[in-house]
């Protein structure tokens, strides 16, 4: 999906009002400097691409974050403020339902959410170019 035509300010507002709190809640108990920042993004569409990937794509050691509160709110924000986004996600959602597993917070998931916090932080930067 190409995030170029999203309403970035509305997504930013959704992040600041709710998603950020849910990320904080998920990370509760984690040490500030436990994880290094290794994922970056250069502009807002790129940040959303990386955020979508880390939030919804299973990775080794972290099977799924998609059912977490921050992920559901991220999905809702993208569906509302990115034209055509929800249509592209229908097949992906059906595939995910088939492989849904018991929710376990692993250290790898915490590291991944730490990276997500960094990506969202970059997305919110006022001078970050859109293109």
């Amino acid at each position: 999906y190409d995030f170029t035509n999203c309403d970035f300010e509305k997504i930013k507002a959704a992040y600041l009002s709710t998603i950020s709190k849910d990320l904080i809640t998920y990370m509760s108990g984690t040490k500030s400097t436990e994880f290094n920042n290794t994922v970056s993004c250069s502009n807002r569409p790129h940040c959303l691409t990386e955020i979508q990937s880390l939030t919804f794509n299973p990775t080794a050691g972290c099977a799924s974050l998609a059912k977490e509160m921050f992920a559901m709110k991220t999905k809702a924000a993208l569906a509302i403020w990115c034209p055509g986004y929800s249509e592209t996600q229908i097949n992906a959602t059906q595939a995910m339902k088939k492989r849904r597993k018991r929710k376990v917070t692993t250290n790898k998931c915490l590291e991944q959410v730490s990276q997500l916090q960094g990506l969202w932080r970059r997305f919110n930067r006022p001078l970050l170019k859109q293109q």
Epitope: I24, T25, M27, K31, S32, N36, N37, R122
Partner: antibody, heavy 118, light 107 residues
């Protein structure tokens, strides 16, 4: 282990600028955010701003915006905080402090006292 | 910005006493609150993070609790080295803000 070593005390006249340094060691400099916090005598701690050394992006407390500039020298693993248009109420101890993506401060510099007086 | 209102500002107590310091946030900060101890001429030292988690090396007599808008730091049995100033800080949202401190003095 992580260490943050700050430059020495400064005395300045009103209207001048001051630049305080914070040399970091014991970790990869680009991995974490560097913040500056100040404490005026008998006053609250006040967060001034932060820098991401990986790309030098800064965020500032609006109370200081326009007067404070935070920079880094990657080759020296050193962060700097410059405060301009000094006034007497800027007399304070200035601290650098380190965080990851979660913003509580588990590592602090020893502090630099800045005195502003005519 | 979120305001952190700390009370009391001053507290007199004796060695062995149990003391409680309170911090109230002007809006919900979940559990994103840290507590610091500061001695004269020194940098603050982290005691508690995530409202209730003790930092490495912090004695078990220090404990934190709370969520949402009300938080407490408790020292179960004061030791001579505990007489200092204590600050709370919220890191739930930008800009990060501190309470104005509680100075704990020997009675």
């Amino acid at each position: 282990q992580v260490q943050l070593v700050q430059s020495g005390a400064e005395s300045k006249k009103p209207g001048a600028s001051v630049k305080v340094s914070c040399k970091a060691s014991g970790y990869t400099f680009t991995s974490y955010l560097m913040h500056w916090v100040r404490q005026a005598p008998g006053q609250c701690l006040e967060w001034m701003g932060e820098i991401d050394p990986s790309d030098s992006y800064t965020d500032y407390n609006q109370n200081f915006r326009g007067r404070v500039t935070i920079t880094v020298d990657m080759s020296a693993s050193t962060a700097y905080m410059e405060l301009s248009s000094l006034r007497s109420e800027d007399t304070a101890t200035y601290y650098c402090a380190l965080t990851g993506t979660i913003n509580y401060f588990d590592y602090w510099g020893q502090g630099t006292t800045v005195t502003v007086s005519s | 910005d979120i305001q952190m209102t700390q009370s009391p500002s001053f507290l007199s107590a004796s060695v062995g006493d149990r003391v409680t310091i309170t911090c109230k946030a002007s809006q919900d900060v979940v559990t994103a609150v840290a507590w610091y101890q500061q001695k004269p001429g020194k940098a603050p030292k982290l005691l508690i993070y995530w409202a209730s988690m003790r930092h490495t090396g912090v004695p078990s007599r220090f404990s934190g609790s709370g969520s949402g808008t009300e938080f407490t730091l408790t020292i179960s049995s004061l030791q001579p080295e505990d007489f200092a100033t204590y600050f709370c800080q919220q890191y739930s949202s930008f800009t990060f803000t501190f309470g104005c401190g509680t100075k704990l003095e020997i009675k």
